[in-house]
Interface confidence: medium
């Protein structure tokens, strides 16, 4: 009959707004995985049928509803019954293959926050004007793309630090909308970075930073 | 420990106004919108508004747009909600909530009984 | 705004029984419904986020259901401890509204 399938392990989320994936190990041998996943309330859908990776992107899945509580399992399944789709993933006497649930996933609660970019800045007299790109995400309603400011509302605010070019301390401001108003000395050229933050969750509460960007490097009107 | 703890009883006169508190602690306060809702003797809960402790900035149910304000004071983690032209039937118990990731009320205070009548 | 609406008004069941609370939305609010007990003299407490998610501290006796306008509340084995007004609500689209509550009692 052969070895049975090994179980994989460590299944882990890998998740930054929104793009999913599932992973875990270790790398088959003589056997594949097909990994299930449902709501709470749904049925299992098959995904990554028969593949010999370790990992399974999900995103197509958690972004139809992404305050939805996911469950997914990793299954093991013998080379013979691999090759014929979910049929015959169950074995002669209709056993189920060996698997392993991955943790429940809640997009909404514990994607990643991926670091922001800074779209443009504008000095009038001693006011600057930051904006933040406003970031897509492959969430989508009514056939549209919604941002990351559509999807968390007003869960969602930037952190600015901004400092003179010339100094190394820096200030710090914060907006619920994607924009920035900040005083600043006339004559000084400053330097900015953001960061996303979702200030009640308690897990992946803020994004990395977002590149650095200067004024007095093109000028001070500035677009990407 | 998250705690809500709000003023206490409060007894006025048709016409008159309220103002009730709600002091934080054990949290940032900042990072969570604070709601009022109140609840009429014997009856359901009803949502009264919203502010942002860091902006200070508020959404109201339309029911009480013309009478509610609510402030804040970072200085000393409190929020405040106060109801003008008080009428009899805003007889009731006033609560705080603190506003968790996503929508849902986690932490209330303890109420503040708030009763008008002549 | 979305109207919620709950049923039964009131429920008596014997120690150890399964009770079912329904809620249902005068229009679709996806998974956005929390269920809060509330016993009495006491204020609200957070029993169910997402329509299905348990709050920290709840016992697993306590399980929601239901997406787009029907969720229900179930409490498997019921206790003494149990007996309360549940609520749900609605934090899918502001403002944010109650049902009118289901009082639990022991039979």
């Known amino acids: 009959a052969g070895t049975p399938p090994g179980k994989a392990f460590n299944l882990t989320w890998i998740s930054a707004d929104f793009k999913t994936i599932l992973a875990w190990q270790p790398k088959p041998t003589n056997y594949t995985y097909t990994v299930q996943i449902s709501t709470k309330s749904g049925d299992w859908k098959y995904k990554c049928t028969g593949t010999t990776d370790t990992e399974c992107a999900l995103t197509d899945e958690i972004v139809k509803d992404v305050k939805q509580t996911y469950l997914a399992r990793v299954l093991s399944v013998p080379w013979r019954n691999s090759t014929h789709g979910k049929e015959t993933l169950f074995g002669t006497h209709g056993e189920e293959p060996p698997f392993t649930n991955a943790p429940e996933f809640t997009p909404y609660l514990e994607t990643n926050l991926g670091a922001p970019t800074i779209q443009s800045f504008e000095q009038v007299g001693t006011k600057v004007n930051v904006t933040v790109e406003d970031e897509r995400t492959l969430v989508r309603r009514n056939n549209t793309f919604l941002s990351l400011r559509d999807v968390f509302g007003k869960d969602l605010i930037y952190t600015l630090a901004y400092w003179k070019s010339s100094s190394s301390g820096a200030k710090t401001a914060a907006t619920n909308t994607n924009e920035f108003l900040i005083d600043v000395d006339k004559g000084e050229n400053y330097c900015f970075s953001v960061q996303a933050v979702i200030p009640s969750r308690t897990v992946n509460r803020a994004s990395t930073d977002s590149p650095v960007e200067c004024m007095g490097q093109e000028h001070h009107h500035h677009h990407h | 420990e998250v705690q809500l703890v709000q003023s206490g009883a409060e007894v006025k006169k048709p016409g008159a106004s309220v103002k009730v508190s709600c002091k934080a602690s054990?949290?940032?306060?900042?990072?969570?919108?604070m709601n009022w809702v109140r609840q009429a003797p014997g009856q359901g809960l009803e949502w009264m508004g919203e502010?942002?402790?860091?902006?200070?900035?508020?959404t109201y149910n339309q029911k009480f747009k013309a009478r509610v304000t609510m402030t804040v004071d970072q200085s000393t983690s409190t929020v405040y909600m106060e109801l003008s032209s008080l009428r009899s039937e805003d007889t009731a118990v006033y609560y705080c909530?603190?506003?968790?990731?996503?929508?849902?009320?986690?932490?209330w205070g303890q109420g503040t009984t708030v009763t008008v009548s002549s | 705004s979305i109207v919620m609406t709950q049923s039964p008004d009131s429920l008596a069941v014997s120690l150890g029984e399964r009770a079912t609370i329904n809620c249902k939305a005068s229009?679709?609010?996806?998974?956005?419904i929390a269920w809060y007990q509330q016993k009495p003299g006491q204020s609200p407490k957070l029993l169910i986020y997402?329509?299905?998610n348990r709050y920290t501290g709840v016992p697993d006796r306590f399980s929601g259901s239901g997406y787009g306008t029907d969720f229900t509340l179930t409490i498997s084995s019921l206790q003494a401890e149990d007996v309360a007004v549940y609520y749900c609500?609605?934090?899918?689209?502001?403002?944010?509204?109650f049902g009118g509550g289901t009082k639990v009692e022991i039979k």
């Open positions: 909530a603190r506003r968790e990731l996503g929508g849902p009320f986690g932490y």
């Open positions: 054990g949290y940032s306060f900042t990072g969570y919108y």
């Open positions: 502010i942002n402790p860091s902006t200070g900035g508020s």
């Open positions: 229009q679709s609010v996806s998974n956005g």
């Open positions: 997402f329509a299905s």
């Open positions: 609500q609605q934090d899918y689209s502001s403002p944010w509204t």
